[in-house]
């Protein structure tokens, strides 16, 4: 009989749907299920999760989550982790070198550690060494060949020959820049006395009475001398190298800095004259700055005196910069002393000199111009008539003169006329009209008159407006319009309703809400009445709110 | 007579780069300011894209900003146009023009599609 | 931005009459403003700039109007070529913007 398989106890991991499937449990074998494992585990086969299979001798995989190690929690100062993979699996093995310089606890090269249970099996770790070093005229007192950090090594001289002063013996120390100095043996004869004195000058040090070869010592100037060839000389074979020169320098006075000043000025001041190479903080005026653009910078004292030589360089901002009908610009909003910026124009405006752009510079003082852009007006279009000048371009306020082709006048039988550039352009077109196109006076209306004066002939496509009386309604367009010699159709003006007293007595009424003796009504008003008292209605309701058509109103009549 | 030419490629794929380059000839790109980009979307109406002047300097389209370069080449005598991240959205007829004297180019359709 | 409105989107005229488009600002934009015309499959061409200036070469039966934020664009008597879309354009301050478009076909 098959035996069949109880629940798993994934140890690390579960079953998916593990509450739903617990009901199919005892598995027959041959059964799969998937099952994930927890973070730091993984399948046999490497992956988060897989398939367990219940066989003839139980689940398969036996052991379905294995531990698994992470490179990144491996922590190696002065070594290396081999590249191969990031993550291993329980036993896994792991190899890592030492950088030159550094050995592992055994004095190795390089070692491993290995994934277990509970993690990597150690933290590798890379200890600093020194190797036997090279013995000058000397020998080591003990046989190891590598050497742990503060580790001592003893040396002695051979015959002849000493370390320091006499002595024959001496140790150095493994260090973290490696041995504290070589085991050198020297022969008296080599050694120095005390360096040169020079002018000007000392060595950085106090003198000793004998040096080492190849001892080096260094020297410095006093203020005001340059140094002069290398600062330091070196003993050898019994004698030191040249010593440097102190040469006298210039030094630079208190630096008086245009639109600007050194900062701490006051306190600084009893300093000077400075040596060369001396470097001083500095600030600028409002509207100016350093060359790099800034508004603090170094100034510093050289050879040639004080660079930079104009500390503070004006500077021109674009809010300084007015234009009317035009824009700036955007690349920046500060410009540097001789920087350039851009403008345009918008249409129908142009520059001084007739153009759609221009520039203006930053200068000492502030900007080279400021940018103006010019009301101008195009060359018209003529019609029925030509200029009497070539130019293409008009500023505000420039007249054009022009003519009319023959057969063709402006009014009153002239052929020449001007237009004037304003500020919406031309004054007007310059045309010119067939005489037979024109229209005379335009007719006169009943109670009403033209908001104009009229003139004796008016030129095609005029318009003429119209008003009525007070009170007069005017139907139809205001407007008549002069068209192949004729006028339009001009407006009437319709008669308003004049309501009277003696009108209202005879009808026994009065004006509802009114104590108006005469009223006037337009067209299309209506007039409320009311009966007088002690007089009664004697036509219908309407009546009482009479309208008034062109003149005429029905009163209504109480008794 | 100043005239002005747009080049480039009529198909952009979807999240690709929309490149034009408008030549400009009978003129120097130095005389002017308004060298500017117009788009107008098929059956729709005209949408400002940005302009710049000859030193190089920019005004673009806030609505495009994030996505939009024009540059100038004094040396070719010509201006160019970026669009990046394009979408079928950005499927239109490209002008370009020098927006002061009313100089216009053809005009090319790009289409943005797969 | 500055958005520009036109009324009416649309119109239907007869050769001969007078046609007018308005165009409204959101906010002043003193007299920067151009008047376009765009014929189908055209490339778009100036009429008017600096709201009643005539560009050159353009029939002065075009003519503009306006300040601040009332614009109008007049065609005092409409002429077979004139039937195409009209469009304001502000260039007071960036970023430059248009209006929506008036179409005028044949009644």
């Known amino acids: 009989e098959v035996k069949p398989c109880d629940f798993p106890e994934i140890q690390h991991g579960g079953l998916y749907y593990k509450s739903l499937r617990r009901l199919y449990f005892p598995a027959a074998a041959g059964q799969s299920y998937s099952y994930y494992c927890d973070q730091n585990f993984v399948t046999p086969s490497g992956s988060y999760w897989d398939y367990i299979h219940c066989t003839q001798d139980g689940w398969s995989p036996t052991v379905p989550c294995l531990r698994t190690c992470s490179k990144s929690d491996v922590e190696i100062e002065n070594g290396f982790i081999s590249e191969s993979s990031s993550i291993y699996i329980l036993n896994e093995e792991t190899q890592y070198n030492c950088k030159p310089g550094y050995a592992t606890a055994e004095g190795n090269s390089s070692g491993s550690i290995t994934c277990l249970q509970n993690g990597w099996s150690t933290q590798p770790i890379c200890i600093k060494f020194c190797d036997m070093p090279v013995f000058e005229n000397s020998r080591a007192k003990s046989n190891g060949m590598w050497f742990k950090l503060h580790d001592t090594l003893d040396y002695e001289c051979y015959d002849g020959y000493e370390s320091s002063y006499g002595n024959t013996t001496d140790s150095i120390v493994c260090g973290e820049d490696g041995w504290s100095h070589l085991p050198t043996c020297y022969n008296s004869s080599e050694n120095c006395g005390p360096p040169p004195p020079i002018s000007n000058g000392d060595t950085t040090s106090f003198p000793q009475k004998v040096y080492l070869p190849w001892s080096r010592v260094e020297y410095q100037c006093q203020s005001y001398y340059e140094l002069q060839g290398s600062k330091y000389v070196t003993c050898s074979n019994g004698d030191w190298s040249e010593p440097p020169r102190c040469i006298s320098m210039k030094p630079c006075e208190f630096p008086e800095i245009q639109h600007g000043h050194l900062y701490y000025e006051n306190t600084r001041r009893p300093y000077f004259p400075v040596a060369t190479g001396q470097s001083y903080s500095y600030y600028c005026d409002q509207n100016f700055v350093t060359p790099s653009g800034s508004y603090w910078d170094y100034i510093h004292c050289t050879q040639d005196g004080w660079l930079p030589t104009v500390p503070c360089l004006r500077t021109c901002s674009k809010s300084d910069i007015e234009i009317e009908n035009g824009f700036i610009s955007e690349s920046s909003s500060i410009y540097i002393l001789n920087k350039e910026i851009q403008y345009k124009c918008k249409p129908g405006y142009a520059t001084a000199d007739g153009n759609s752009s221009g520039s203006i510079t930053c200068l000492q003082n502030g900007w080279s111009a400021q940018p103006i852009c010019i009301k101008f007006c195009d060359m018209p279009v003529f019609e029925n008539s030509r200029a009497k000048s070539n130019g293409m371009r008009f500023k505000l306020h420039d007249t054009l003169d022009y003519e009319c082709y023959d057969g063709y006048e402006i009014s009153y039988g002239n052929t020449t006329g001007s237009i004037v550039c304003g500020e919406d352009g031309w004054s007007h077109f310059p045309t010119c009209y067939n005489s037979s196109e024109k229209c005379g006076p335009p007719p006169p209306i009943s109670n009403g008159d033209t908001t104009s004066f009229l003139l004796k002939v008016y030129v095609p496509q005029s318009r003429v407006e119209y008003q009525c009386q007070s009170y007069y309604e005017l139907q139809g367009s205001n407007y008549v319009t002069c068209s192949n010699g004729e006028w339009s159709e001009p407006p009437r003006c319709i008669h308003p309703c004049i309501i009277t007293e003696e009108n209202m007595n005879k009808n026994n009424i009065q004006l509802k809400g009114k104590s108006d003796i005469k009223y006037y009504a337009k067209t299309g008003d209506t007039i409320e009445f009311m009966c007088k008292l002690g007089y009664n209605a004697n036509t219908s309701v309407l009546s009482f709110q009479a309208v008034c058509r062109e003149g005429i109103v029905e009163y209504p009549r109480c008794e | 007579q100043v005239q002005l030419q747009e080049s480039g490629p009529g198909l952009v794929k979807p999240s690709g780069t929309l490149s034009l380059t408008c030549a400009v000839s009978g003129g120097s790109i130095s005389s002017s300011n308004w060298w500017t980009w117009v788009r107008q979307p098929p059956g729709k109406g005209l949408e400002w894209i940005g302009e710049t002047y000859h030193d190089g300097s920019t005004n673009y389209n806030p609505s495009l900003k994030s996505r939009v370069t024009i540059s100038v080449d004094k040396s070719k005598n010509q201006f160019s146009l970026k669009l990046s991240s394009v979408t079928a959205a950005d499927t239109a007829v490209y002008y370009c023009?020098?927006?002061?004297?009313?100089?216009w180019g053809q005009g090319t359709l790009v289409t943005v599609s797969s | 931005d500055i958005q520009m409105t036109q009324s009416p989107s649309s119109l239907s005229a007869s050769v001969g009459d007078r046609v007018t488009i308005t165009c409204r600002a959101s906010?002043?934009?003193?007299?920067?403003l151009g008047w376009y015309q765009q014929k189908p499959g055209k490339v778009p061409k100036r009429l008017i700039y600096a709201a009643s200036s005539l560009q050159s070469g353009v029939p002065s039966r075009f003519s503009g109007s306006g300040s601040g934020t009332e614009f109008t664009l007049t065609i005092s008597s409409l002429q077979p070529e004139d039937f195409a879309s009209y469009y304001c354009?502000?260039?007071?301050?960036?970023?430059?913007?248009l209006g929506p478009g008036t179409k005028v076909d044949i009644k």
């Open positions: 023009l020098e927006f002061y004297f009313d100089y």
């Open positions: 906010q002043d934009i003193r007299n920067d």
């Open positions: 354009l502000q260039y007071n301050n960036y970023p430059f913007t």
